[in-house]
Interface confidence: medium
């Protein structure tokens, strides 16, 4: 038809113009178009130049949509994780302001001097709620015996106690059971209460990672081609009303997100994992009540080495021998009044719980997020047609979309129409945050079941700010010691705080 | 008594690594935090290094971040500190001194001091 | 860092007080003197006011929110030194020291 040779340009050169494009690229007319490289080769608004502009400009569109959509995503997981984050620190802070408030009364000296052992106690509790490679069972066993050696100074102040007969106390102890049953209980409670609070806010800082490195994959250029095709290629071939067939958009978001929507059953897993852990949040030997309690067990257990002075000074001669008498040393310390405890089982404050409730619904609404991410993108920010069938554009002229919807992922994608997807390789990337998720919910599920794992971060990107109660950057840096240290796949993801030499090993 | 022996030290090159060793004795050294303390010439004391009784805890000084490793071996009673890409201001008396606590790295905590062992880096 | 007086300054017998400010409130000081330049130091206090048995009781130490004061009663001529007080950093937990107060008799 004579008459469409000389359609006006005009529309294509509005929206060109409207991209902040030059406008003298534009033909004033339709011109033909065998220098087309990406769009059907009819008669054409769009130069060489300007299908290569379009082209670049659909794709940094769709990579900026696709930012957008995990940037939501993303900061719902960073507040999750700073709520939750907030509120255990904030326990433990609470234990320890109470022990600091109430055990210099109620103690005197055994526990003034001794203040730097609490203080690092919390201090270690804290780097291991935070994912610090260490052992909790070690070193509260560590913290009895050097609190116990201590004490026992303290209340033998006539009497000469070297470091040998340190020792020999020290190989009694587990049998003398000085400070009562409080030690065992703690430790008990305590690696299931830190291991699930930690596990679970180290979940979401590893959704929320995974989710800002796929974010950064770049899209290929095959799906460049595709979506230039999808998006412009209308406005260049005369039919700028034309809106993409919403089946259409779909295969070749699929086709470029194809190796996004393999993170999907990983994705599931990890979230069923952390909305199952938040069960162990309850209970007496839950989060909130045991971090919470810290410092009553501590009590109960000095009022308990008190009590059993007597009794364990007897056994201690009897298995460690007679002790020398200090000659400058004074009379042996009074018996202190019994600290008072605090009630051990905090009333649940109700913060927890509307944490738990709000995180539950939303982790649910996200878990379809990476196979629902191109039918999103799709009707979010492509302007789909809502036309009847035979109305829409379909790729080549405006008209009804024929092929069948591919499948998600990338095996499903071998006969995409649209996007050449080679299948034989997949992204490295986005198969290395699909390890990140098994081995975050491999913890998860063992953490469920009480189990002490050792967070080993080995971040890439070094990020963290320091947790201000321990370490700084590497000015303090936390290893395992050697009877603990185990060859385990590193998690690539730090705790906020957590600097990147927290959690080396030694060697 | 206690006796801390410091040695590694002498004249050093920029750019190059520097390992020094402390050798205790006369307490029981896995009981207690050990710590590297320099003195530049005609400046004061200053924190380099600290290690916690178990080995699990380091603590560094700002101006050897990054460059040093501190190390304890119970079984010799050593305490070794390793120092990197050496400047000239890394000159001064390293002092290898022992904490009375088994927590690191408090500079109140200080109880015996070696002699030092000098090192210049020129 | 830790904050002393640059010197002092005192006759025989009087009494000598040392500040020592800058410290995060809770954590305790150390004391110690050296008598010369490359000399090692000698702890004369540590942990607030734990004396070394081998440390004349004339040196004592006491503490006041962040603030340390090491007291010399009764200063002698062998007490000319140079003094520096020893604190923990909060937030790194690194070992800090003051500059060091040169104190005549």
């Known amino acids: 038809d004579p008459a469409s040779k000389s359609r006006s340009c005009g529309e294509v050169r509005q929206i060109y113009g409207a991209k902040g494009f030059s406008l003298s690229d534009v033909p004033q007319a339709e011109i033909s178009g065998e220098h087309l490289r990406i769009c059907p080769q009819g008669y054409t608004c769009c130069t060489s130049e300007m299908e290569e502009n379009l082209a670049n400009r659909s794709h940094a569109e769709l990579e900026t949509a696709l930012r957008d959509s995990s940037r939501v995503l993303q900061a719902m997981l960073a507040t999750q994780l700073r709520s939750f984050d907030d509120h255990f620190q904030h326990l433990l802070n609470d234990s320890e302001r109470t022990l600091q408030a109430t055990f210099p009364g109620a103690f005197g000296e055994l526990y003034t001097q001794n203040a730097r052992a609490f203080r690092d106690l919390y201090s270690e509790l804290r780097l291991y709620y935070r994912g610090a490679n260490l052992h909790l069972e070690e070193t509260l066993a560590e913290f009895w015996a050097r609190l116990l050696e201590r004490l026992f100074k303290q209340l033998h102040p006539q009497l000469l106690l070297p470091d040998d007969y340190l020792d020999c106390l020290g190989k009694q102890a587990e049998a003398l059971r000085p400070f009562g049953e409080a030690p065992r209980e703690l430790r008990l409670r305590a690696t299931r209460a830190f291991v699930a609070a930690r596990s679970f806010v180290q979940g979401l800082g590893v959704a929320s990672d995974v989710v800002r490195k796929v974010a950064q994959v770049p899209l290929g250029p095959e799906c460049s081609r595709a979506v230039m095709k999808l998006v412009y290629c209308a406005h260049c071939l005369g039919v700028p009303g034309a809106r993409p067939c919403p089946d259409y958009c779909r295969n070749v978001l699929k086709g470029c997100l194809a190796n996004q929507a393999d993170l999907d059953a990983e994705w599931r897993n990890l979230l069923d994992s952390m909305v199952l852990i938040t069960d162990k949040f309850w209970g007496t030997s839950g989060v909130e009540s045991v971090i919470g309690s810290v410092h009553t067990w501590l009590a109960e257990a000095i009022n308990a080495l008190q009590d059993n002075r007597d009794t364990l000074t007897a056994k201690v001669i009897q298995g460690c021998g007679n002790p020398k008498v200090n000659p400058q040393g004074p009379g042996p310390e009074e018996k202190r009044r019994r600290g008072k405890l605090a009630p051990r089982e905090r009333p649940p404050s109700g913060t927890l719980e509307k944490l738990v409730s709000e995180a539950k619904a939303q982790l649910r609404d996200v878990q379809d997020f990476w196979i629902s991410l191109p039918g999103t993108l799709c009707s979010e920010k492509m302007a789909l047609s809502t036309a009847s069938d035979d109305r829409c554009w379909n790729g080549m002229a405006r008209g009804r979309y024929l092929p069948e919807v591919m499948g998600d992922g990338l095996a499903n994608q071998i006969n995409n129409p649209e996007v050449e997807v080679d299948i034989t390789k997949p992204d490295m990337t986005i198969r290395q945050q699909i390890m990140q998720l098994k081995i975050m919910t491999n913890r998860l599920r063992s953490a469920y079941n009480g189990n002490d794992v050792d967070f080993q971060d080995a971040s890439d990107d070094g990020s963290g700010s320091g947790s201000g109660d321990g370490c700084l950057d590497d000015l303090c840096s936390r290893k395992v010691s050697r009877k603990s240290s185990s060859s385990r796949t590193p998690l690539t993801h730090a705790l906020p705080g957590l600097s990147e030499q927290e959690g080396q090993k030694t060697s | 008594a206690v006796t801390l022996d410091e040695s590694g030290g002498g004249l050093q090159t920029p750019g190059r690594a520097l390992s020094l060793v402390c050798k205790a004795s006369g307490f029981t050294f896995s009981r207690y935090a050990m710590y590297w303390v320099r003195q530049a010439p005609g400046k004061g004391l200053e924190f380099v290094a600290g290690i916690g009784n178990t080995g699990r805890y380091t603590g560094y000084g700002s101006a050897v971040k990054g460059r040093a490793t501190i190390s304890r071996d119970s079984g010799q009673s050593t305490v070794r500190l390793q120092l990197n890409n050496l400047r000239a201001e890394d000159t001064g008396n390293y002092y290898c001194?022992?904490?009375?606590?088994?927590?690191?790295?408090?500079?109140?905590?200080?109880?015996?001091w070696g002699h030092g062992t000098e090192v210049i880096v020129s | 860092a830790l904050t002393q007086p640059a010197s002092v300054s005192a006759n025989p017998g009087e009494t000598v007080k040392i500040t020592c400010s800058g410290g995060s409130s809770g954590y305790a000081y150390g004391w110690y003197q050296q008598k010369s330049p490359g000399s090692a130091p000698v702890t004369l206090l540590y942990s607030n006011n734990n004396r070394p048995s081998d440390i004349p009781s004339r040196f004592s130490g006491s503490k006041s929110g962040s603030t340390a004061t090491l007291t010399i009663t009764g200063v002698q001529a062998e007490d000319e030194a140079v003094y520096f007080c020893?604190?923990?950093?909060?937030?790194?937990?690194?070992?800090?020291f003051g500059a060091g107060t040169t104190l005549t008799v």
């Open positions: 001194a022992k904490s009375v606590s088994p927590y690191c790295c408090d500079a109140a905590d200080i109880d015996a």
């Open positions: 020893g604190s923990v950093d909060s937030s790194s937990y690194a070992g800090i």
